[in-house]
């Protein structure tokens, strides 16, 4: 048989006598139907004039238009009330009714859980006409039933705008337990208890749960679903699953890995992206996070110099992006750089150390003893200075930059000259007469331009005045001398 009809059923034929036509009466199309006692409330109406309906599924016609004969009550015959079957089996069930021939256009529809079944369902209605009545059998078949087919099925028939409803046929599809909640992968702190949850449903119920840890059953006896397992803590990674059992068999959940949080692995591939005189831009590839998100990282910087005190500078930064600009470094210096990152458990070891260097810096001091005097015969200004005492880190001197500003009657004009590193004097042409010339000099290295010297002013008279007294800056001083000639 296609179905498992679990009822105490006395088989009886669908119709009192043999039906005309070619009705198949094999067991796959017509189930053994249990006899159910008791009558349904009637729905009263006349073939020509509908009366007030009662609640129920029986229609009792009154007198026919011929006037003499009372028609039998209209009702669906009782059928099997509850069909229990396994998933993927086929099932066929039916409704039957005998309708007096005076009724035309009878249609039977199938409904499941209050909704009409339309479209691609296997519903067949067969008519077996006789002299006075037509036997109608509406069959509904489902191939390879699924849990979603569970529910209450009924037939409805409309006659003269009245509705006749059959008794419900309950379809219960049973199968292996179906998980509604499975354990989830987690990252946990070592030796700290945590919970896992497993829930499965039938039918059939009950569903019982066994927990499995690393292939060993945790509970000797099953627990009713849903089940919460309190794991007392782990010292190493473990795999958990749950087994759900019911009368149909066993379903095993996915296995989930529970990882133990640990300190991260050290970062790798620390690289230099850009160096300046006082900063280095680095990046790194984070190591394994130890099953816990990175919180921050620490960049450690040691100066590689036999004379340095070996102290380590530490710069804390966010874990992302994996990049950091180390600032406040000395120019033209060598550094060893390492990176360590932390998660909630602790700090990783330091990455392999890498060497990096800063570039030359700009000079930090200005040229000394700047003197300026007017050479009127040549119509130029002579400038002299002393080479500054630059530190090694400033790099090699490549020259000087001379700024001279000419101011006269509200007009101001700045000019810049570049001279080579071997010079300690320069001449500039007089640009404007009857004006003040302000001169400043800066040393230049590959690392940039250093600070300018204090300004030295000289007055350039109109043509015909002669004086060779210089203007100058005293060596260490910061005065602003002016010599007017």
């Amino acid at each position: 048989a296609i179905t498992e009809a679990r009822e105490e059923a006395k088989p009886y034929p669908l119709f009192p006598g043999p039906l005309p036509g070619s009705l198949q009466t094999d067991h796959t199309s017509l189930l053994s139907l249990p006899h159910t006692s008791g009558y349904q409330p009637a729905l009263m109406f006349s073939p020509t004039q509908p009366g007030r309906p009662y609640t129920g599924n029986v229609a009792i016609p009154r007198v026919t238009s011929a006037g003499s004969k009372l028609l039998p009550p209209l009702a669906f015959k009782h059928t099997v009330g509850h069909i229990i079957l396994s998933e993927h089996k086929d099932v066929k069930f039916n409704c039957s009714i005998s309708v007096p021939n005076i009724y035309q256009d009878t249609t039977i529809s199938w409904w499941k859980d209050g909704k009409e079944l339309l479209g691609a369902h296997h519903a067949i209605t067969q008519f077996y006409p006789d002299d006075e009545v037509t036997a109608i059998i509406a069959s509904f078949s489902i191939t390879s039933v699924q849990r979603s087919d569970n529910g209450s099925y009924i037939c409805k028939m409309k006659i003269n705008n009245e509705e006749i409803v059959s008794d419900p046929i309950y379809i219960e599809v049973q199968g292996l337990p179906h998980f509604t909640k499975q354990p989830e992968s987690m990252n946990v702190t070592r030796n700290t208890a945590f919970n896992l949850t497993c829930q499965a449903v039938g039918p059939p119920e009950p569903v019982n749960i066994f927990w499995v840890q690393n292939s060993s059953r945790v509970n000797e006896q099953p627990e009713k679903s849903p089940s919460v397992l309190t794991v007392p803590g782990l010292t190493e990674m473990a795999v958990f699953s749950c087994e759900a059992h019911n009368d149909k068999g066993l379903t095993v959940s996915k296995g989930v890995q529970i990882n133990i949080k640990a300190i991260p692995s050290p970062p790798t591939e620390v690289s230099i992206h850009n160096s300046t005189a006082h900063s280095i831009l680095i990046s790194w590839v984070p190591g394994f996070d130890g099953y816990s998100p990175f919180r921050n990282c620490s960049v450690q910087v040691k100066e590689v110099d036999p004379l340095s005190n070996g102290s380590v500078m530490i710069f804390n930064t966010s874990a992302s992006p994996h990049m950091y600009q180390i600032k406040q470094l000395q120019a033209l210096a060598n550094y060893s750089i390492g990176v360590s990152c932390m998660n909630e458990i602790g700090w990783s070891a330091v990455s392999p150390w890498i060497l990096a260097s800063t570039t030359e810096g700009a000079p930090s001091v200005a040229p000394l003893n700047v003197t300026v005097f007017l050479n009127e015969s040549r119509d130029n200004v002579d400038i002299r200075w002393m080479k500054p005492l630059t530190k090694r880190q400033a790099g090699e001197l490549v020259g000087y930059r001379i700024s001279h500003v000419w101011q006269s009657a509200g007009i101001s004009k700045e000019l810049l000259e570049e001279v080579g590193q071997n010079n300690s004097r320069a001449q500039i042409s007089v640009q404007v007469h009857n004006a003040t010339c302000t001169v400043r000099i800066a040393a230049v290295t590959k690392g940039g331009v250093g600070p300018f010297s204090d300004p030295v002013k000289i007055f350039i008279p109109a043509h015909g005045w002669v004086d060779h007294a210089p203007s100058s800056t005293p060596a260490p001083g910061n005065a602003d001398p002016v010599l007017i000639i």
Epitope: N191, W211, N214, S216, E220, Q221, P222, L229, P232
Partner: antibody
Framework: QIQLVQSGPELKKPGETVKISCKAS????????MNWVKQAPGKDLQWMGW????????TYADDFTGRFAFSLETSASTAYLQINNLKNEDTATYFC???????????WGQGTLVTVSA | QIVLSQSPAILSASPGEKVTMTCRSS?????MHWYQQKPGSSPKPWIY???NLASGVPGRFSGSGSGTSYSLTISRVEAEDAATYYC?????????FGGGTKLEIK
């Protein structure tokens, strides 16, 4: 509170049978397995096996197959250990212990001393 | 089946001393339980799943370990701790107990 109460001491002759009981209270008897543990005088603990109190299915450790039988009277929340054809080496204290997750025996009976002597 | 070896078999300590007893298994196990037994009494649950103290167990007791090596430590031994301590593994059937460590107080 949870309690496991075992029957009193037994003095038996070799070849005889003994049946000791373990009555549980304070929890749902059929939710947890019942384990049996043997301790010979001056010796260590030996796990004998357990019985599934829901299905009645017993599981025996290798050293305790054959003459040993676990059984239940579920309605009385009682587990039984029967030893047939007693031998001198069966002289020991037998404990019942309530099973739990991870085979943790959080509750023990007070023990039943079985002495086998001619 | 997994064999559990406890050492030392007998441990003698003075009150206030720190003592450690070990339990080694012939194969790796997931958890080790510990029970305390005094003469004439049934075993008492003592440490659950390697490191969790059972209800009523004093805080001076602790458990640790993983794989094949587990230990029970008493930070400051007291006279009432005199007993035999048994380990029991979870991770493989059949359940097995160790041979016990007898703690004597001087």
């Amino acid at each position: 509170q949870i309690q496991l109460v075992q029957s009193g001491p037994e003095l038996k002759k070799p070849g005889e049978t003994v049946k000791i009981s373990c009555k549980a209270s304070g929890y749902t008897f059929t939710n947890y397995g019942m384990n049996w543990v043997k301790q010979a005088p001056g010796k260590d603990l030996q796990w004998m096996g357990w019985i599934n109190t829901y299905t009645g299915e017993p599981t025996y450790a290798d050293d305790f197959t054959g003459r040993f039988a676990f059984s239940l009277e579920t309605s009385a929340s009682t587990a039984y250990l029967q030893i047939n054809n007693l031998k001198n080496e069966d002289t020991a204290t037998y404990f019942c212990a309530k099973g739990g997750h991870y085979a943790w025996f959080a509750y023990w009976g007070q023990g039943t001393l079985v002495t086998v002597s001619a | 089946q997994i064999v559990l070896s406890q050492s030392p078999a007998i441990l003698s300590a003075s009150p206030g001393e720190k003592v450690t007893m070990t339990c080694r298994s012939s194969s790796s196990v997931s958890y080790m339980h510990w029970y305390q037994q005094k003469p004439g009494s049934s075993p008492k649950p003592w440490i659950y799943a390697t490191s969790n103290l059972a209800s009523g167990v004093p805080g001076r007791f602790s458990g640790s370990g993983s794989g094949t090596s587990y230990s029970l430590t008493i930070s400051r031994v007291e006279a009432e701790d005199a007993a035999t301590y048994y380990c029991q593994q979870w991770g493989s059937n059949p359940r097995t107990f160790g041979g016990g460590t007898k703690l004597e107080i001087k």
